[in-house]
């Protein structure tokens, strides 16, 4: 059985303030069953940005239909980017459980925010 990998192809993404940012993430396997979550940062302050299964994230939308069978694209789009959104974002695969268990993290994508073009 091939080991699950979580791939974030871009090391960095630069977006102008007010635009949308697309953060790409794919998984190499559907197994084991469990959600993908997106976080900003690592350690104690790690901030939940998007949860595939629960929560309310008004500025974040999945790029691909998460309900589609065999979907392995977990990319997200964050709308109306501001300088406060800068940081390193991680796509993380969890195994379903109570609670869910973290399995594998992508390498991270650093989002930088450029000034709005005048």
């Amino acid at each position: 059985e091939e080991e699950l990998q979580v791939i974030q192809p871009e090391k960095s993404v630069s977006v102008a303030a007010g635009e949308s940012a697309t953060l790409n993430c794919t998984a190499t396997s559907l197994i084991p069953v469990g959600p993908i979550q997106w976080f900003r940062g690592v350690g104690p302050g790690r901030e939940l940005i998007y949860h595939q299964k629960e929560g309310h994230f008004p500025r974040v939308t999945p790029v691909s239909d998460p309900t589609k069978r065999n979907n392995m694209d977990f990319s997200i789009r964050i709308s109306n980017i501001t300088p406060a959104d800068a940081g390193t974002y991680y796509c993380v695969k969890f195994r379903k459980g109570s609670p869910d268990v973290e399995l594998k993290s992508g390498a991270g994508t650093e989002l930088s925010v450029r000034a709005k073009p005048s």
């Epitope: 940062g41 350690g43 302050g45």
Partner: antibody, heavy 117, light 108 residues
């Protein structure tokens, strides 16, 4: 406005237990890391424990195995269960919201824990 | 563990003076330093993060600078409400997060 309100402090004997609570409002609690920071009388600040937005837990060495941090996202509440308390645990315990890059942007007013016989 | 050393321990100054507080780290922390102000009987308040970024609502007289292992907090013209204890905190290595011992700024 972000508000953090601690409760549960008090006087306890060495070896005893206490559970601190921190009720949060003004932000989406479940998405953010939360922490406990303490300050012994007349001393500086010491980070004690944290629970990240993913529910991972972290402790400073001196409390590992004695303190347990937990959270109830449905109640917007952070807890610190303190067991086997020692005199050196006497301090004001502050609840603080942790930013994504690990500093503290909002603090509660603190609750005093006194460990004495 | 990253150890932060603040100096001086106490600073006696007059209102209107310029004040510079120093925080030294035991190893490089890539500019990941925060500064807090604490007045007697109050909780700490975030002033500066990422060495030089002012937190929301913090007056322009507070500024931070530094890189590598040496960082400074400067208050350009000390106001009466600025007499307090100031702490630095590194947010580079979170195992564990550590604070400096504090600098007390008192009225001369």
């Amino acid at each position: 406005d972000v508000q953090l309100v601690e409760s549960g402090g008090g006087l306890v004997q060495p070896g005893g237990s206490l559970r601190l609570s921190c009720t949060a409002s003004g932000f989406t609690f479940r998405n953010y890391g939360m922490s406990w920071v303490r300050q012994a009388p007349g001393e500086g600040l010491e980070w004690v424990s944290a629970s990240s937005g993913s529910g991972s837990t972290y402790y400073t060495d001196s409390v590992k195995g004695r303190f347990t941090i937990s959270r109830d996202n449905s109640k917007n509440t952070l807890y610190l269960q303190m067991n086997s308390l020692r005199a050196e645990d006497t301090a004001i315990y502050y609840c603080a919201k942790v930013t994504w890059n690990n500093f503290f942007d909002y603090w509660g007013l603190g609750t005093l824990v006194t460990v004495s016989s | 563990e990253i150890v932060l050393t603040q100096s001086p321990g106490t600073l006696s100054v007059s209102p209107g003076e310029r004040v510079t507080l120093t925080c030294r780290a035991s190893q490089g922390i890539a500019g990941k330093i925060a500064w807090y102000q604490q007045k007697p009987g109050q909780a700490p308040r975030l002033l500066i993060y990422d060495a030089s970024s002012r937190a929301t609502g913090i007056p322009g007289r507070f500024s931070g600078s530094g890189s590598g292992t040496e960082f400074t907090l400067t208050i350009t013209s000390l106001q009466s409400e600025d007499f307090a204890v100031y702490y630095c905190q590194q947010h580079y290595d979170w195992s564990p997060l550590t604070f400096g011992g504090g600098t007390k700024v008192e009225i001369k």
